[in-house]
């Protein structure tokens, strides 16, 4: 019968020929009367055999990631009779792995959106690297993830690649962050290969800013001839939030005379001061009103940011009109 062990050949060998192993029949008594033959894909090109001894050699550099095993057939012939000494048999040459592939992030580009002010521990995104080396061969494809850029706001779980928030962030200070993650094989041991990826993390807005008046005092004038409904001027607040979170409503907080009203122009986010009752210079030639501004939409959980509405004082001067 055939006598052999498992055949292995390391990938990426640079020698011109590498001894893989030996085919042998137990009927071979060493008098050189047997001829060994190698058949199948790779025979004669990748592998050659010494027909007299049965020694197999790899004559090409092999890449396990391209082909991890070769199924070949062995024959042994008695050269005196030309007959097969043993039945033709299949055997396998396995290409053994070396750590010649770095981890690669295949799902790039990574982008995630997370609400600003999210608490520590909030999951942002999971990044996953692949290593073409053999996962069953030592640590060649066992990866560890680490953060190269993104501290102190982000952290990455070493074995899963899950990115989490490690410090609260304020969109109004910075609205996006580039995080760089490194994956290292060999579980980070010496000789490890690495790959990196960038993750763009955008902060979505939460309503953590109340609108604030641009001015503490506005001065407006109104003619005593102005009819009710006249727009006498505008006031404006700013809100560092964006979109719906920056929409605001203006109102009168204090106007004992009940002469004015304020309506909100939702297009421009301005407050328009409207004359509600006609004024008379001789009766009263100036008015003071206090206006306030609040966000249109406020989430119950964010009420702490909106406890006191911003106010402004408006001095309104009545312009005299000569009466006939």
């Amino acid at each position: 019968g055939w006598v052999w062990n498992q055949f292995f050949v390391p990938e990426e060998m640079n020698t011109t020929s590498h001894h893989v192993g030996r085919l042998r029949s137990d009927l071979d008594n060493g008098n050189n009367s047997f001829q060994y033959k190698l058949l199948g894909a790779g025979a004669g090109s990748t592998f050659i055999i010494d027909e007299r001894t049965g020694d197999i050699y790899a004559i090409e550099k092999l890449d396990r990631e391209e082909r991890s095993l070769y199924i070949l057939r062995a024959q042994v012939i008695d050269i005196t009779t030309g007959r097969a000494v043993e039945p033709e048999s299949e055997f396998v040459i396995k290409v053994s792995d070396i750590n010649d592939n770095e981890p690669k992030f295949l799902d790039e580009p990574y982008e995630a959106i997370v609400p600003e002010m999210s608490p520590e521990g909030t999951l942002v995104i999971q990044v996953t690297a692949s290593d073409a080396d053999d996962p069953s061969s030592g640590n060649n494809a066992r990866l560890l993830y680490s953060l190269l850029q993104g501290q102190p706001y982000f952290s990455v779980e070493p074995t899963t690649g899950v990115i989490r928030i490690s410090s609260k962030m304020d969109r109004e200070l910075q609205d996006e962050y580039w995080v760089i993650i490194q994956a290292k094989d060999m579980i980070g041991q010496p000789g490890a290969l690495s790959g990196t990826t960038s993750v763009l993390i955008k902060l979505s807005d939460v309503n953590d800013n109340k609108p604030i008046f641009k001015e503490s005092l506005y001065r407006l004038t109104v003619s005593e001839s102005a009819p009710t409904g006249t727009s006498i001027g505008t006031i404006m607040a700013y809100d560092n939030d964006i979109g719906e979170n920056a929409e605001m409503d203006y109102s009168i907080e204090e106007d004992d005379s009940q002469t004015f009203d304020i309506i909100t122009n939702h297009e421009t986010q301005e407050g328009i001061v409207i004359l509600k009752k006609k004024v008379n210079f001789e009766h009263q030639n100036h008015y003071g009103i206090r206006a306030k501004v609040k966000n249109h939409h406020v989430d119950e959980q964010l009420m702490k940011y909106h406890t006191e509405a911003s106010t402004t004082f408006i001095k309104i001067q009545v312009e005299d009109v000569d009466e006939p």
């Epitope: 503490s216 005092l217 001789e282 001067q317």
Partner: antibody, heavy 119, light 107 residues
Amino acid sequence: QVQLVESGGGVVQPGGSLRLSCAASGFTFSSYDMHWVRQAPGKGLEWVAVISYDGTNEYYADSVKGRFTISRDTSKNTLYLQMNSLRAEDTAVYYCARERYFDWSFDYWGQGTLVSVSS
Amino acid sequence: EIVLTQSPGTLSLSPGERATLSCRASQSVSNTYLAWYQQRPGQAPRLLIYGASSRATGIPDRFSGSGSGTDFTLTISSLEPEDFAVYYCQQYSNSWTFGQGTKVEIK
């Protein structure tokens, strides 16, 4: 600190003219409405005129309307009162005063300058 | 115009006593637009109270103002020597007018 210093007072004949000045310092002059107030000898205070912070609006007491003109020069931080057709009843100490930012009372006053109208 | 009438014309009191000065308007003063000023001899007026009851910067808390509509009061809780002066009320609801003044003199 806020300072208002009046000058330009003196003795003038009835029908004559005088120009008072008020030099302002220690605050942003262009942000405040400014007033003139007078006080006849031994009498009470009488409001005279106001000019808006930007100089676009002026208002006068009926007793001086048409004779007095209030003006300001922001580049010089100075308030003026041009007084024409002066009468004996215009004799008084003239004060300039700053209007409070958030209402219409007068939070700072100058030391005053005396105007005497007599023949 | 709104006419302000102050009473009494003169108030004779001793240091440490309480002074109560009255100011009555000929018509309602809107939004409590009323101020009180102190004028010592030979000096310019000084703002004490604005908005009928708010103390101006640097004014001691013995000075207090109250009232609304047509009746207003300035109270000095305990007179100090430097408080003997003339006090004027002023309305700024419609233009600016002053009362004729109340003199607080040492008894």
